[in-house]
């Protein structure tokens, strides 16, 4: 079992870990479709990690600890994009993770509802946006979900940050 998150370190009693859900506007787009702006949240913060020199034989205490600011609760919603002029594919559905709450959690921990957006491929075109992940933390969501080598055009991205939670 992963160790519980650390909020204070003895060496730095004046510093506390923090992790917040920041309101963002996220653009969801796809080549040839009208982009949609949705309100979402991103996890942003500073969580503690440390690494203590090891010994042999190894001590029983954990020498390495890593917490990351990541979704504590999220849900996946369908965002439907209208694609005018495309008779064969008049609409495109995308799954988008809506982050509800964030917290410092063990770096390897699975978020509550994880998975990657079912990204769709297509060259940049009207309504499509350059793709960058909207998550400030670099940890991919584990659990068998496999990212593409790079975000394809049309992947959702952050347009701007809004007010704090």
């Amino acid at each position: 079992a992963a160790p519980p998150p650390i909020n204070k370190l003895a060496l730095f009693p004046d510093k506390s870990a923090w992790c917040e859900a920041k309101n963002i506007t996220q653009i969801v787009g796809h080549s040839g479709c009208e982009a949609k702006s949705i309100q979402n949240r991103a996890c942003l913060g500073q969580c503690f990690s440390y690494s203590v020199p090891n010994t042999f034989p190894q001590s029983t205490e954990s020498l390495v600890h890593c917490d990351s600011c990541m979704p504590a609760q999220s849900m996946w919603e369908i965002v439907t994009l209208e694609c005018p002029g495309h008779e064969e594919v008049p609409r495109v559905d995308k799954l988008v993770e809506k982050i509800l709450h964030c917290s410092c959690q063990a770096c390897g921990k699975e978020p509550s509802h994880e998975g990657l957006s079912v990204y769709v491929q297509g060259e940049d075109g009207p309504g499509s946006q350059p793709g960058t992940h909207p998550h400030p933390h670099p940890h991919p969501h584990p659990g068998g979900q496999t990212p593409e080598p790079e975000d394809p055009p049309g992947a959702p991205h952050t347009e701007e940050e809004g007010a704090e939670d």
């Epitope: 996946w76 919603e77 369908i78 559905d93 998975g115 769709v120 491929q121």
Partner: antibody
Framework: QVQLQESGPGLVKPSQTLSLTCTVS??????????WSWIRQHPGKGLEWIGY???????YYNPSLKSRVTISVDTSKNQFSLKLSSVTAADTAVYYC?????????????WGQGTMVTVSS | QSVLTQPPSVSAAPGQKVTISCSGS????????VSWYQQLPGTAPKLLIY???KRPSGIPDRFSGSKSGTSATLGITRLQTGDEADYYC???????????FGGGTKLTVL
Amino acid sequence: QVQLQESGPGLVKPSQTLSLTCTVSGGSISSGGYYWSWIRQHPGKGLEWIGYIYYSGSTYYNPSLKSRVTISVDTSKNQFSLKLSSVTAADTAVYYCARDAPLRIGAFDIWGQGTMVTVSS
Amino acid sequence: QSVLTQPPSVSAAPGQKVTISCSGSSSNIGNNYVSWYQQLPGTAPKLLIYDNNKRPSGIPDRFSGSKSGTSATLGITRLQTGDEADYYCGTWDSSLSAGVFGGGTKLTVL
């Protein structure tokens, strides 16, 4: 006319891994434009959605099964596959592969005929 | 226990009309499109309705779909004996972050 065909062992022992393959004919997985799924139906019961895969390899799994499920795609063989680990008798079901209507979530317009998988020792 | 609630069975005479209900909540039917499937005995399900009320090509106009609030309805007119089957509704559930189906309704044509 796109057709789907499931294949794999009909009997799996408890605690082992269930492995099924769906072969797509009459169309190419790698052309994009479709999401591909696995769905199962327990004997005499309703349908349960297992997960999605896109030709690029992106996956999305039902959270209730995610810890045991792996879906993969082999575009060179025009196939996608399901692996379900640590199976129990509760995983006994007819397993279907299906295709979503063009880039829609949850509108499965083409189905395989299904393959019955029994979990028993 | 299915997330979406359907009546276990409905019946009507040939030539009559029948409706099958599918009840959910705001996290599924209330905010997402509904699909309907027909499963004839011993066969795979077949898509009848998608986007609440659209029919794929080849599906006769005897089949119709509608949605109001957190409920959806499948209508079948001019019933035929060949319509005897199990019917399932399906949609996305945002709270569960998964696709969900109803428990199915067995239609008997008397």
